[in-house]
């Protein structure tokens, strides 16, 4: 029986700069029941606080709700692991909410085959930004990426869409079912997960772009 091993805070993410969650990996348990607590202070302050919510983010997590989240302050946090034989502390982690934003994926991905009479047909897709992100405030610039592939292909074809929420693709294989996904990222932050795949059957008479 030993004191617990050193835990590690390995990830902090915010969906929208208004709340955030951090997760830690336990060290070895020393063969005894181990309790974990996350404590933090804001840079420039000495007053220590304990994690306000160990539940919302799931096991080994700390969630900071709106009232505990400040955008313009750096958080200094560490995790303490304790059992009957002693304690161990993680390294301190410095967190600035501005740089840990990982939005939810975009919504309402719509994919259509357009066949104008006077031009080559194309695949047109549009989507909406995630609901938790308020783009009107100007705090966010969201960038988008789309990927698509024939159903049985192993490789995705990826396109950067910039800030636009629609995109056209001209080169497609007629008669194939295509999978399409979209994701987004803020200018300082992480890519979202890919949205669920939307699928569309390309007509057999779809004319390939020259």
């Amino acid at each position: 029986q030993l004191p617990p091993g050193k835990p590690e805070i390995f990830k902090c993410r915010s969906p929208n700069k208004e709340t955030f969650t951090c997760w830690w990996r336990p060290g070895t348990d020393g063969g005894l029941p181990t309790n974990y607590s996350l404590t933090y202070h804001r840079e420039g302050e000495t007053l220590m606080h304990e994690c306000p919510d160990y539940i919302t983010g799931g096991p080994n997590s700390c969630h900071f709700g709106k009232q505990y989240t400040s955008m313009w302050r750096t958080y200094v946090m560490m995790v303490n692991a304790t059992n009957q034989m002693g304690s161990s502390f993680s390294d301190e982690l410095y967190v600035d909410v501005t740089y840990i934003v990982q939005p939810d994926p975009p919504l309402e991905l719509t994919v259509e085959v357009k066949q104008p009479e006077d031009r080559k047909p194309y695949l047109w897709m549009k989507w909406s930004p995630p609901t938790l992100i308020d783009l009107k405030t100007g705090w966010f610039t969201l960038l988008y990426e789309i990927r698509l592939k024939p159903e049985k292909a192993a490789e995705w074809e990826t396109h950067f869409a910039g800030q636009q929420t629609e995109f056209k693709i001209l080169s497609l294989h007629p008669g194939q079912k295509y999978l399409v996904q979209v994701r987004c990222k803020p200018d300082h932050g992480y890519w979202s997960a890919w949205s669920p795949a939307t699928f569309i059957q390309i007509p057999s008479d779809f004319i390939m772009n020259d």
Epitope: L107, E108, L109, A154, L179, A193, W194, S195, F199
Partner: antibody
Framework: QVQLVQSGAEVQKPGASVKVSCKVS????????IHWVRQAPGKGLEWMGN????????IHAQKFQGRVTMTGDTSTDTAYMELSSLRSEDTAVYYC???????WGQGTLVTVSS | EIVMTQSPATLSVSPGERATLSCRAS??????LAWYQQKPGQAPRLLLY???TRATGIPARFSGSGSGTEFTLTISSLQSEDFALYYC?????????FGGGTKVEIK
């Protein structure tokens, strides 16, 4: 012809774990993201999560957070779903489903009973 | 999460008649909606995706309509093999969710 063939029925005690396999044929697993769906006896369908073998990313329903692990072995074209800390409410038929929903495994009955 | 509500829970229809099943989403899912048929002891079978596109091998008597939050599955002339459970499911965002199902039974 694409087929998803799942492992056989399991009986587990409360608190134990179960690992269900899903062997893909007629397709490579690399090309096929896999959803896991379950159905308790006499109840409706419940989406559990998605595993994308291409990038190893997993997404799961909040209620399974910390209990479900979805993995895949591209060398054998087999996807796996492990559910831990089993309770009686986890008694269900578990299905693996291809990304476009038109390919379903035959289902694996997991019974949790002391 | 998006809540999918199906109505009615049970629909009694005579063979040869039309059946209309409804599915409502608690927020817009665009056209990212699928319909399934399930018979006792079997895995579900995909009928429609994209709200209105028939899956491979699905007869023309099955049709779907709607977008946003209101969707309908119509079976134009019920055959004996169509008496089953029907589920809708959105794939607009994570988590995917299913409706509670509609049982179509013989009147």
């Amino acid at each position: 012809q694409v087929q998803l063939v799942q492992s056989g029925a399991e009986v587990q005690k409360p608190g134990a774990s179960v690992k269900v396999s899903c062997k893909v044929s007629g397709y490579t697993l690399t090309a096929l993201s896999i959803h896991w769906v379950r159905q308790a006896p006499g109840k409706g369908l419940e989406w559990m999560g998605n595993f994308d073998p291409g990038d190893g990313e997993t997404i799961h329903a909040q209620k399974f957070q910390g209990r479900v692990t979805m993995t895949g072995d591209t060398s054998t074209d087999t996807a796996y779903m492990e559910l831990s800390s089993l309770r009686s409410e986890d008694t269900a038929v578990y299905y693996c489903v291809g990304v476009t929903f038109d390919y379903w495994g035959q289902g694996t009955l997991v019974t949790v009973s002391s | 999460e998006i809540v999918m509500t199906q109505s009615p829970a049970t629909l009694s229809v005579s063979p040869g008649e039309r059946a209309t099943l409804s599915c409502r989403a608690s927020q817009s899912v665009a056209s990212n909606l699928a319909w399934y048929q399930q018979k006792p002891g079997q895995a579900p079978r995909l009928l429609l995706y994209g709200a209105s596109t028939r899956a491979t091998g699905i007869p023309a008597r099955f049709s779907g309509s709607g977008s946003g939050t209101e969707f309908t599955l119509t079976i134009s002339s019920l055959q004996s093999e169509d008496f089953a459970l029907y589920y809708c499911q959105h794939y607009n965002n994570w988590p995917l969710t299913f409706g509670g199902g509609t049982k179509v039974e013989i009147k």
